[in-house]
């Protein structure tokens, strides 16, 4: 998952309390026993922000040695720093671990920017704000990287919540959640509430600022808002979905879906914007330029490289327009939407100007590897990840940042057809496709 | 070629309002590829941005001057103009108008530049 | 704020030499810089943006380098036309208000 532009996290957030809540509805879905409720111990469990990834605490080994585990939905290795790097607070410590088994095998995993490598083996890992189990999973000591982890971060490692057939060096070795689900009662799914600032932090702020929700095995109410919609993962890989059509402001951009998918369309909590496919990303640029035509902002600003500051508190999003993904229902013919606000697409930056300004990047950025639909759509929703029943649901977040006027939504259903279509087939190869 | 040119009054009294305006020649100030923006410079001194101003009539401006600076633009004048109100002698300085191209982020075209006074 | 600082505040150099001058800035600003000339009782005339791209019409004497936070305006051979104040200016955080302090290039 293209860690040039995937992760990368510099501060922690503001979760649940942050900008305005919407209330919550009453219309619940039937329960579903041992699926659905109060997980009151893993809410809130998550600190970080999308411009460097959430993480949750993990322990790994006996004693138990706590570190800090960027939640990474794009990828499917556990693998944490086992060694000193000027950026680690801490690291792993194999030898102070009795219950550490060698595995005898090396894993190298390169990215577009940047790689790590290390040394496999197993070890007992839990969660203290997850579910009261410990496993053995596998564990990738990673004793050499390179643009990997990130200064001021508070991360360790990685959790990659994908599947076996992404994981390095290859789908033989089981990923973290597998082991999970195999060796306990916790059902096979998980759910994420990832809660964007909607403004700057600063550091003090960060640190004592919390991030969302990792509901592992379960759903619950209090994270969303409205009914959960689903689409299909299409194949169990990455958590790969198909998107049918796109709209700026209610405008359709009018493109064959598969250029939507071209090569692939996922759900990636690791990577901080929202990736198009450079056709897409060009339309869907000049739409929003289009939209938002009465003010002019620089080249650069488009490529999200530079920061447009307004006055704080003056940013005016009204200027900018919704975006609005609709995705492949599990009913024939049928399609749901999910439409994020500039709130979410315009991401806030701390520390560059001054008190009296709110500065901004644009977080919508071009890919040549599918569409990304990365932390600035999932910060808009609950989203859940029901591996049992091979399905995606997406629901308006408890805690998305919005304004008086607009808010983020999941609405349907819609008549779409031939959305099988939508789908682009990857040529096989003989070689990995995934040099990411 | 395009060419910009500040006028106003070089002598202003205290807690008066300022005044100038640039007029853009051998170009269309309602082009979209560029904001129009002024830029002080007081004597011996460097530069500070004071504001911009896009042919929509969208306006930014300089935060410590925030309060007291008006940019307007007039189209069919091919102009735009500068109000600094309530100006003291640390308001003396020579006013330039600019072009702001290059993806709207640098300055690539300047006028002369205009010293105005503030005096009584 | 990102501030810019520029050094040396005064180069004195002969006509021939190579004046380097440079901008730091106190937090990265990518390659979004820009250098500015202004000769005494003129205006500023851009030189370099882009930290590295040369304006239309400058010679090429006049080179910029750097990205993030330290930026270099090189003048390979200075010509008596190019004694005269050089100032930086970001534009990583837009609009674009920020001005380094300046470098006067005299003759020795």
């Known amino acids: 998952t293209q860690h040039g532009i995937r992760l990368p996290l510099r501060s922690g957030l503001g979760g649940a309390p942050l900008g305005l809540r919407l209330p919550r509805e009453t219309d619940e879905e039937p329960e579903e026993p041992g699926r659905r409720g109060s997980f009151v111990e893993m809410v809130d469990n998550l600190r970080g922000k999308s411009g460097q990834g959430y993480y949750v605490e993990m322990t790994v080994g006996s004693p138990p040695q706590t570190l800090n585990i960027l939640v990474d939905t794009g990828s499917s290795n556990f693998a944490v720093g086992a060694a000193p790097h000027p950026f680690l607070h801490r690291y792993y410590q194999r030898q102070l671990s009795s219950t550490y088994r060698d595995l005898r095998k090396g894993v190298y995993v390169p990215y577009t920017q940047g790689k790590w490598e290390g040394e496999l083996g197993t070890d007992l890992v839990s969660i203290p704000h997850g579910p009261n189990v410990t496993v053995r999973a596998n564990i990738a000591a990673i004793t050499e990287s390179d643009k990997f982890f990130i200064n001021g971060s508070n991360w360790e490692g990685i959790l990659g919540l994908a599947y076996a057939e992404i994981a390095r060096p290859d789908d033989s070795l089981e990923p973290f959640f597998d082991s999970l689900v195999k060796q306990t009662h916790v059902p096979n799914l998980f759910s994420l509430q990832l809660c964007g600032a909607g403004f700057p932090l600063n550091q003090s702020e960060v640190l004592a600022s919390v991030g969302g929700s990792m509901i592992i095995g379960g759903i619950d109410h209090s994270l969303y808002t409205g009914s959960l919609w689903y689409t299909p993962i299409r194949r169990e890989w990455y958590y790969e979905v198909i998107i049918v059509r796109v709209e700026i402001n209610g405008q359709d951009l009018k493109m064959d879906c598969k250029e939507y998918n071209y090569d692939k369309s996922i759900v990636d909590s690791g990577t901080t914007n929202l990736r198009l496919p450079k056709k897409v990303f060009e339309a869907a640029v000049k739409s929003i330029k289009a939209a938002s035509s009465t003010e002019k902002f620089p080249d650069g600003f488009w490529l999200g490289e530079q920061l447009v500051c307004w006055q704080a508190g003056t940013t005016p999003w009204n200027i900018f327009p919704v975006i609005s993904l609709y995705l492949m229902g599990e009913v024939t013919n049928q399609s749901f939407r999910i439409t994020i606000l500039p709130q979410q697409y315009l991401r806030p930056v701390e520390d560059v100007a001054t008190s009296q300004d709110d500065c901004y990047k644009f977080a919508i950025s071009q890919s040549s590897t599918g569409t990304v639909m990365g932390a600035v759509i999932m910060e808009g929703f609950y989203v859940v990840f029901d591996r049992a029943r091979k399905r995606i649901g997406f629901a308006v977040s408890a805690c998305h940042v919005h304004d008086e006027f607009r808010t983020a939504a999941v609405e349907g259903p819609f008549v779409t057809l031939d959305m099988e279509d939508c789908g682009y087939n990857i040529p096989q190869t003989d070689e990995s496709t995934l040099m990411t | 070629q395009l060419q910009l040119q500040e006028s106003g009054p070089g002598l202003v009294k205290p807690s008066e309002t300022l005044s100038l305006t640039c007029t853009v020649s051998g170009g269309s100030i309602s082009s979209s590829s560029y904001y129009w923006g002024w830029i002080r410079q007081p004597p011996g001194k460097g530069l500070e941005w004071i504001g911009m101003?896009?042919?929509?009539?969208?306006?930014w401006y300089n935060p410590s001057l925030r309060s007291r600076v008006t940019i307007s633009v007039d189209t069919s004048k091919n102009q735009f103009s500068l109000k600094l109100s309530s100006v003291t002698a640390a308001d003396t300085a020579v006013y330039y108008c600019?072009?702001?191209?290059?993806?709207?982020?640098?300055?690539?075209?300047w006028g002369r530049g205009t010293l105005v006074t503030v005096s009584s | 704020e990102i501030v810019l600082t520029q050094s040396p505040a005064t180069l004195s150099l002969s006509p021939g030499e190579r004046a380097t001058l440079s901008c730091r800035a106190s937090q990265s600003v990518s390659s979004y810089l820009a250098w500015y000339q202004q000769k005494p009782g003129q205006a500023p005339r851009l030189l370099i943006y882009?930290?590295?791209k040369r304006a239309t019409g400058i010679p090429a004497r006049f080179s910029g380098s750097g990205s993030g936070t330290d930026f270099t305006l090189t003048i390979s051979s200075l010509e008596p036309e190019d004694f005269a104040v050089y100032y930086c200016q970001q534009v990583y955080t837009w609009p674009p208000r920020t001005f380094g302090g300046g470098t006067k290039v005299e003759i020795k």
């Open positions: 882009d930290a590295s």
């Open positions: 600019a072009r702001v191209g290059h993806g709207v982020s640098y300055f690539d075209l």
């Open positions: 101003i896009y042919y929509s009539g969208s306006t």
